[in-house]
């Protein structure tokens, strides 16, 4: 029933406001009055959808009244001032505070004007990622674990990996009511090639400015993988000494190297020095198969290499030594 032709007043407020569990939040609400327009505000009212009564009222003569005085406060409204700012502060946010709120101005001569605001109650999750140390199982097992604890809404976890595999993600109630803990496992068939490689857990949440990336270095325990190097099939009599190296990859590290031959102990011209075997010059041809046996906490593995020291043409002075 306002006079015809008048510009209208507008209640300005965001459609959605985020707030953090346990913190305080301000629900902003302002009355926008066009330049030539006159209005008089007598009451500010906040109510919540689905609940009876109003939660906060600011009355032109009675001042503020609250359904929960310790948790609510008009930010700017004061007795004796123009009531144009109905912004309301809520303290100690709880999960049950999430919902739709109506901010209402009782004005003259325009009548009541209101706007709805959705309050989102968020909880920022804490994120951790850890390796799941595994052995060679021959079947898919979790090799990394990423946990986003106490998020509201639940965090979204994804994995980035060049190693293959697949995620297994689950949710459980968080420590605080209404929060969620998300656990995601990265599952693959362990192999020695995976050991020491990394996968990345990416955690996304409304409360983060950008996704959090957590890198996990994988650990696969496996017995030694052994090979012998240093022989090039061109060893000749009367040449320098040569060296064979026992190359072992294992996790944990090898605890011991043992050299022998298929005939038993090492011949006098072969001297073991840990992972290396020193072959001294010989004066007659040999044809010997050397064995390197490597041990770690998970077991022992060995490799064999047959070495021939041949009579060579005198025109080839180089020979036995491959280093």
């Amino acid at each position: 029933w306002p006079p015809p032709g008048t510009g209208d007043i507008i209640v300005q407020a965001p459609t959605q406001v985020p707030g953090f569990l346990g913190d305080s939040v301000t629900l902003p609400c302002y009355l926008q009055v066009p330049g030539m327009e006159e209005t008089h505000v007598s009451q500010l009212t906040w109510s919540r959808h689905g609940e009876s009564g109003s939660m906060a009222v600011f009355h032109q003569t009675q001042g503020p009244n609250y359904s929960e005085p310790k948790r609510l406060e008009f930010v700017a409204a004061r007795l004796g001032t123009e009531l144009r700012d109905a912004s309301l502060r809520m303290f100690g946010l709880r999960v049950e505070d999430e919902g739709n709120y109506t901010c209402l101005f009782v004005t003259f001569p325009q009548g009541s004007r209101s706007v709805d605001i959705w309050l989102r109650v968020l909880a920022k999750p804490q994120n951790t990622a850890e390796v799941q140390k595994v052995q060679l199982t021959g079947k898919p097992v979790p090799v990394a674990r990423c946990v986003s604890t106490g998020g509201r809404p639940p965090a979204h976890i994804t994995w980035h990996s060049d190693l293959g595999g697949m995620p297994n993600t689950s949710q459980a109630p968080g420590f605080l009511s209404g929060t969620v803990t998300v656990t995601s496992l990265w599952i693959l068939v362990p192999s020695s090639q995976v050991d020491g490689k990394s996968v990345t857990c990416k955690v996304e949440h409304e409360s983060f400015e950008k996704p959090q990336l957590l890198t996990v270095n994988l650990t696969v325990y496996y017995p030694p993988e052994v090979s012998i190097s240093g022989y090039d099939n061109n060893w000749y009599l009367s040449q320098n000494e040569a060296t064979l190296t026992c190359d072992a990859r294992s996790n944990p590290e090898p605890t011991g190297y043992n050299w022998s031959t298929t005939m038993g102990p090492l011949p006098p011209f072969a001297v073991a020095q840990g992972a290396q075997l020193l072959i001294r010059p010989v004066d007659k041809p040999i044809n010997t198969t050397f064995i390197c046996n490597v041990t770690n906490a998970l077991g022992a593995r060995q490799a064999e290499l047959t070495v021939q020291v041949k009579e060579g043409p005198p025109s080839e002075p180089s020979g036995m030594s491959s280093n």
Partner: antibody
Framework: EVQLVQSGSELKKPGASVKVSCKTS????????MHWVRQPHGKGLEWIGG????????SYNQRFKGRVTITVDKSTSTAYMELSSLRSEDTAVYYC?????????WGQGTLVTVSS | DIQMTQSPSAMSASVGDRVTITCKAS??????VAWYQQKPGQPPKALIY???YRYSGVPDRFSGSGSGTDFTLTISSLQAEDLAEYFC?????????FGQGTKLEIK
């Protein structure tokens, strides 16, 4: 102390006009909207309209179809309600009331009797 | 126009009784409802605003509740001086409208 003091009773003939005054004191006149409400004897309350003294902005109940005019005199902190084309059913006690969304202070009432 | 329907239109109760008066709006008025007490020969007196908030100086035996379309005024322990007529009023939209009143008598 907030006070709203209205003019005395009026006896009017049908078709005439009546102008009732409401002199205020005890508060800043221009900070509150002033409204008028009537009550026929033994009946309920009916809102007539209101005015904001500062801006002169008004709002009227359409039921009165342009018969009502509400004005103010800021210099004397007085509000006026004039009702024209009176008929017998306009016989009632007329109240001025300070508006705060609801009506927190009321005048003592002015009896307007319309009778031939 | 929004109709405000009060019930009962009249009632009698004894001192100390709990008295409840209801008011039903024909459409949603949020919490923009006031309650008034009118004693014989006097203007109305504001008791409650915004459906549930008591004016300063109003005894705490008077309480209001409700939102939307259904509202209640309760007198928790009736006193002799509460003999009066009670009105509800909506100020959600123009024209402002009142209930037809509830006349309260003391037995």
């Amino acid at each position: 102390e907030v006070q709203l003091v209205q003019s005395g009773s009026e006896l009017k003939k049908p078709g005439a006009s009546v102008k009732v005054s409401c002199k205020t004191s005890g508060y800043t006149f221009t900070e509150y909207t002033m409204h008028w409400v009537r009550q026929p004897h033994g009946k309920g309350l009916e809102w007539i309209g209101g005015i904001h003294p500062n801006s002169g902005g008004t709002s009227y109940n359409q039921r009165f179809k342009g018969r009502v005019t509400i004005t103010v005199d800021k210099s004397t902190s007085t509000a006026y309600m004039e009702l024209s084309s009176l008929r017998s059913e306009d016989t009632a006690v007329y109240y001025c009331a300070r508006w705060t969304g609801d009506f927190d202070y009321w005048g003592q009432g002015t009896l307007v009797t319309v009778s031939s | 126009d929004i109709q405000m329907t009060q019930s009962p239109s009249a009632m009698s109760a004894s001192v100390g009784d709990r008295v409840t008066i209801t008011c039903k709006a024909s459409q949603n008025v949020g919490t923009n409802v006031a309650w008034y007490q009118q004693k014989p020969g006097q203007p109305p007196k504001a008791l409650i605003y915004s459906a549930s908030y008591r004016y300063s100086g109003v005894p705490d035996r008077f309480s209001g509740s409700g939102s939307g379309t259904d509202f209640t005024l309760t007198i928790s322990s009736l006193q002799a001086e509460d003999l009066a007529e009670y009105f509800c009023q909506q100020y959600e939209s123009y024209p402002y409208t009142f209930g037809q009143g509830t006349k309260l008598e003391i037995k």
